[in-house]
C-alpha cells in the first residue's frame, strides 16, 4: 500500500485547506525535474532560472556561463544546442508547433570564440529540423522537406535531396503517421558516431488518402487543413532509407540501404535506425501485419561505396500470441565489439526481458528473468549494463534502476535506487553522461519529485539537482487526498488499481466514485508517481473517490495480460473496468447510485463503451476526444492490435467494436461528449459519428466542441474543459456548487 503521508493533526486542521479547481488550472502545485544536458563524461549544460546557459563541471564543482541571457534575448531564443566542438551554439526562436513532436523554428548560430552571431550564409526560415554532427560543427537541417548539409555554420549549404514536396515527399522528417505511431520523433535523419555519414528516411505519401478539416481562425472563410493520414486498411507511406558521405557528399550521392527480402515481399514499415560504428548501421523493419520484425545489420563497402546487409546479419523477432514488441519494437543497444547487442523482448514465459544476441536470436542469452519486466536499457559500458524494471517488491507500477556487472562472471545485479528514498521514490528514470561516468536520477514519486546526481562507478549521491522545496512548502497547508495502490485477483487476472481517497476518508461512509480510464494497449495508469491534478481536487474538495484500474491489454505484467486484447479491442478493457467497479462496491464505502467514468482518447472510447455496456453501474460519464470506430484511426496503430478491416481478416470485429453500434444503450446514462474540431490525431469525425448515431436513436446527451483545438485541448480550452466537466460531475453526483 502506498499512502501519502497525511500531515493533518487536529490542532492544525483549521489552517489546512482543500485543493481548489483554480489551484489545478493555475498549475500552483506543479513540480520541476532536472535533466542535465551532458556534453562530456563530467560536464553538463543547464539553462538557469534567469536564462543563462551554464556549464557545470562535476569534478571541480564549478560552473560558468557560456552564453548570457542577453544573447538569448537578443533573438528571443527559447532553446539552444552546443556544437560538439564547443565552438558554436544554435539558438532556436519563433517556435511553431505542428503535430505531437514536430515544430518549425528560426535558427541563429552564435560563435562562442568571438562572441558574434555567424553572418553570411544564414539559415533559411522556418526550418523543420536542425542538428549538429556528433563531432565537430557540421550542420544538417531540413527545409521545405529537403535535407541540407553545412560543413561549417558559415559555409554555403550543400543540398542533399531535391524531391521534397509538402504533403507528398518528406526527407529527413517523418510524415504524420510515422511521427505519431512509429518513430515518436520530429526527425528522420541520423548521424554516424563520428559524423562521417548521414542516414535519412524518405517518406512518399503521394498515394495516401487525405484527412481534411476546417480551421476556422478569424477570416471570412475557414482554412482547410489537409494531412495525408492513412486510416486502418488504407494505402500507407512508402519508405526508403539513404546514407550519404558527408565529407564528400557530391562524390557518389545518397546510397539506398536495401530492405530485407522477407520484409520487402509485402507492405512494410521502417521502425528505427541505430548506428553501430561509422561504417556499420542497424536498421529495423516491420511487416504491415506487425507480428514480424527484422533487425538488419549493414556494412559500408568502400570499394563499391554502397551498403551491404548480409542475410547472416538479419535477426527476426516474431510474436505468435500478439504483435511484435510492446508499444514499439525495442531497439538494440550494441556492445563494444560492434556486432553483439542487448535487446528487450519476450522470453519463453511471456515476460519482456533483456537478452544478449551474439550470433542468432535463437542462441540469445537471457540476461534478466522473472515474473516482472525489464523496461528500458539506459546504457551499456565495458563492465556495466544499466536498465529499469518493475521487479522490486512486485509492484508493476514502479520503476527502479539496476546495474548488471557484465565485466565479471557470473554477472551480478544491484538495484541502484530501491533503497535510496524508499517512501518518497519508487518511480525513477535516469540520464547518463559519456561512458556512464556520472548519472542523474529523476524520481517522479510517489512523494514529491527529486532529481539527484550520482557517481557512475560507486553510485554515490553527489548532490541534489532539484528537490522542489517551494512545492513542499506550498503543500504544507493543503489537505491532499490519500492514495493507495493495491490489486484485485479476479478469475486468474490481476487487476492493479490506484484509489484516490478524500483527506478525511471514513470507511463507514459512502462516497461517489469516479473511474478514470485510459486502457490502451501497452499503457499503464497505475503508477507510483506524484501528481496534484484534477482528480486530486475532486477527492480533496468534492469528496469523491477516484479509481484507476489497469486491466487486460495494459503493460509490464507479461504477455498474457498485454496480448489478451489482440484483434479484439473494446472488449476486455471495458469488462475489466466493470469488474473492478463491482469489487469496489463490495468494499462498502461506495455509493452505488453515484458512479461515473471518464477518459480521454483511448480512454474516451473505453468510457463510452462502459457507459453503453448495459450494466446499469454508471450514472454518468465523459468521453473526451474518443475514438468511436477503429476504421477511423491511423493504420500503424490500429492494425498493430486489430489486423486489417477486410472480410478475410478482422472486419467483423471492427464493425462490432464501434461506439455507434451501442447508441441505444446510452439512453439510461448521462453522457458528455467533448472534442476539438482541429484534432489531427483522433479526428472530430469520431465524435460527429457518435453524435449522429445518438440523434438517430433519439437519445439525449450533452456535448461540447472546442473550435480549432487539437487532441490536447490546450490553453484557455483546458480551463473551460475542466470547469465544464466539474459542473457535469457535481450535477451528476448531486453535489452543491
Amino acid at each position: 500500500i502506498v499512502l501519502r503521508p497525511s500531515r493533518v493533526h487536529n490542532s492544525e486542521e483549521n489552517t489546512m485547506r482543500a485543493l481548489t479547481l483554480k489551484d489545478i488550472l493555475n498549475g500552483t502545485f506543479s513540480y520541476k525535474t532536472f535533466f542535465p544536458n551532458w556534453i562530456s563524461g563530467q560536464e553538463y549544460l543547464h539553462q538557469s532560472a534567469d536564462n543563462n546557459i551554464v556549464l557545470y563541471n562535476i569534478e571541480t564543482g564549478q560552473s560558468y556561463t557560456i552564453l548570457s541571457n542577453r544573447t538569448m534575448k537578443s533573438v528571443n531564443a527559447s532553446n539552444y544546442g552546443l556544437s560538439p566542438d564547443r565552438q558554436f551554439v544554435y539558438l532556436e526562436s519563433d517556435y511553431s508547433k505542428l503535430w505531437r513532436y514536430s515544430y518549425t523554428a528560426t535558427y541563429y548560430i552564435y560563435d562562442l570564440s568571438n562572441g558574434e552571431f555567424v553572418r553570411g550564409n544564414e539559415l533559411p526560415r522556418p526550418i523543420q529540423y536542425l542538428c549538429w554532427s556528433p563531432v565537430g560543427s557540421k550542420l544538417a537541417y531540413v527545409y521545405q522537406n529537403n535535407i541540407y548539409l553545412k560543413q561549417r555554420p558559415g559555409d554555403p549549404p550543400f543540398q542533399i535531396t531535391f524531391n521534397g514536396r509538402e504533403n507528398k515527399i518528406f526527407n529527413g522528417i517523418p510524415d504524420w503517421v510515422y511521427e505519431e505511431e512509429m518513430l515518436a520523433t520530429k526527425y528522420a535523419l541520423w548521424w554516424s558516431p563520428n559524423g562521417k555519414f548521414l542516414a535519412y528516411a524518405e517518406f512518399n505519401d503521394t498515394d495516401i488518402p487525405v484527412i481534411a478539416y476546417s480551421y476556422y481562425g478569424d477570416e471570412q472563410y475557414p482554412r482547410t487543413i489537409n494531412i495525408p493520414y492513412p486510416k486502418a486498411g488504407a494505402k500507407n507511406p512508402v519508405v526508403r532509407i539513404f546514407i550519404i558521405d558527408t565529407t564528400y557528399p557530391a562524390y557518389v550521392g545518397p546510397q539506398e540501404v536495401p530492405v530485407p527480402a522477407m520484409i520487402a515481399s509485402s507492405d512494410y514499415y521502417f521502425s528505427w535506425l541505430t548506428w553501430v560504428t561509422d561504417e556499420r548501421v542497424c536498421l529495423q523493419w516491420l511487416k504491415r501485419v506487425q507480428n514480424v520484425s527484422v533487425l538488419s545489420i549493414c556494412d559500408f563497402r568502400e570499394d563499391w561505396q554502397t551498403w551491404d546487409c548480409p542475410k547472416t546479419q538479419e535477426h527476426i523477432e516474431e510474436s505468435r500470441t500478439g504483435w511484435a514488441g510492446g508499444f514499439f519494437v525495442s531497439t538494440p543497444v550494441f556492445s563494444y565489439d560492434a556486432i553483439s547487442y542487448y535487446k528487450i523482448f519476450s522470453d519463453k514465459d511471456g515476460y519482456k526481458h533483456i537478452h544478449y544476441i551474439k550470433d542468432t536470436v535463437e542462441n540469445a542469452i537471457q540476461i534478466t528473468s522473472g515474473k516482472w519486466e525489464a523496461i528500458n536499457i539506459f546504457r551499456v559500458t565495458q563492465d556495466s549494463l544499466f536498465y529499469s524494471s518493475n521487479e522490486f517488491e512486485e509492484y508493476p507500477g514502479r520503476r527502479n534502476i539496476y546495474r548488471i556487472s557484465i565485466g565479471s562472471y557470473p554477472p551480478s545485479k544491484k538495484c541502484v535506487t530501491c533503497h535510496l528514498r524508499k517512501e518518497r521514490c519508487q518511480y525513477y528514470t535516469a540520464s547518463f553522461s559519456d561512458y556512464a561516468k556520472y548519472y542523474a536520477l529523476v524520481c517522479y514519486g510517489p512523494g514529491i519529485p527529486i532529481s539527484t546526481l550520482h557517481d557512475g562507478r560507486t553510485d554515490q549521491e553527489i548532490k541534489i539537482l532539484e528537490e522542489n522545496k517551494e512545492l513542499e512548502n506550498a503543500l504544507k497547508n493543503i489537505q491532499l487526498p490519500k492514495e493507495e495502490i493495491k490489486k484485485l485477483e479476479v478469475d486468474e487476472i490481476t487487476l492493479w488499481y490506484k484509489m484516490i481517497l478524500p483527506p478525511q476518508f471514513d470507511r463507514s461512509k459512502k462516497y461517489p466514485l469516479l473511474i478514470q480510464v485510459y486502457g490502451g494497449p501497452c499503457s499503464q495508469s497505475v503508477r507510483s508517481v506524484f501528481a496534484v491534478n484534477w482528480i486530486s481536487y475532486l477527492a480533496s474538495k468534492e469528496g469523491m473517490v477516484i479509481a484507476l484500474v489497469d486491466g487486460r491489454g495494459t503493460a509490464f505484467q507479461g504477455d498474457k495480460l498485454l496480448y489478451a486484447v489482440y484483434r479484439k479491442l473494446g472488449v476486455y478493457e471495458v469488462e475489466d473496468q466493470i469488474t473492478a467497479v463491482r469489487k469496489f462496491i463490495e468494499m462498502g464505502f461506495i455509493d452505488e447510485k453515484r458512479i461515473a467514468i471518464w477518459g480521454w482518447s483511448y480512454g474516451g472510447y473505453v468510457s463510452s463503451l462502459a457507459l453503453a455496456s448495459g450494466t446499469g453501474l454508471f450514472k454518468c460519464g465523459i468521453a473526451v476526444a474518443p475514438v468511436s470506430s477503429w476504421e477511423y484511426y491511423a493504420s500503424v496503430y490500429t492494425e498493430r492490435f486489430m489486423g486489417l478491416p477486410t472480410k478475410d481478416d478482422n472486419l467483423e470485429h471492427y464493425k462490432n467494436s464501434t461506439v455507434m453500434a451501442r447508441a441505444e444503450y446510452f439512453r439510461n446514462v448521462d453522457y458528455l461528449l467533448i472534442h476539438g474540431t482541429a484534432d489531427d490525431n483522433v479526428h472530430f469525425q469520431n465524435s460527429a459519428q457518435i453524435a449522429k448515431a445518438l440523434v438517430n436513436a433519439q437519445v439525449d446527451f450533452q456535448a461540447m466542441w472546442y473550435s480549432d483545438q487539437n487532441h490536447g485541448l490546450s490553453g484557455l480550452s483546458t480551463n473551460h474543459l475542466y470547469t465544464h466537466m466539474t459542473h457535469f460531475l457535481k450535477q451528476c453526483f448531486s453535489l452543491s456548487d
Epitope: 562530456s40 563524461g41 563541471n57 571541480t60 556561463t65
Partner: nanobody
C-alpha cells in the same frame, strides 16, 4: 580571478613545428575543459583545439592531424604542439576554457607567424 598566460609563439618557416604553452595561475584549469583559439589579422577569432579534464581531445578540421593538444594537470599547463605549419596558421593564439567563459577578458595571446 584565474589568469591564463600563453607563451611559445614565434616566427617559423612553412613545414616547421612550434610548441605553445598555457599556464594557469589557479588549479581550475586541470579539472576543466581547456581550448586553444586563434585570431588571424582581419579575421574573427576561431577555435583550434580542445581537451576535456579526462584527456578527450577535439580539433578543428583545418588543423586535424597536424596539431596536438595536451595537458599536464600536475603542472597546471595546457600545450599545443603544432607540426607542418602553413602560412594560413599565422595568427595570435589564445588559451581559454572550452567553451570560453562568457564575458571574461581574453589574455594577451602569443603571436605565431609562418612565413618563408
Amino acid at each position: 580571478q584565474v589568469q591564463l598566460q600563453e607563451s611559445g609563439g614565434g616566427l617559423v618557416q612553412p613545414g616547421e613545428s612550434l610548441r605553445l604553452s598555457c599556464a594557469a595561475s589557479g588549479s581550475i584549469s586541470s579539472r576543466n575543459a581547456m581550448g586553444w583559439y586563434r585570431q588571424a589579422p582581419g579575421k574573427e577569432r576561431e577555435w583550434v583545439a580542445g581537451i576535456t579534464s579526462d584527456g578527450i581531445t577535439n580539433y578543428a578540421d583545418s588543423v586535424k592531424g597536424r596539431f596536438t593538444i595536451s595537458r599536464d594537470n600536475a603542472k597546471n599547463t595546457v600545450g599545443l604542439q603544432m607540426n607542418s605549419l602553413k602560412p594560413d596558421d599565422t595568427a595570435v593564439y589564445y588559451c581559454n576554457f572550452w567553451p570560453p567563459l562568457y564575458g571574461r577578458p581574453w589574455g594577451q595571446g602569443t603571436q605565431v607567424t609562418v612565413s618563408s
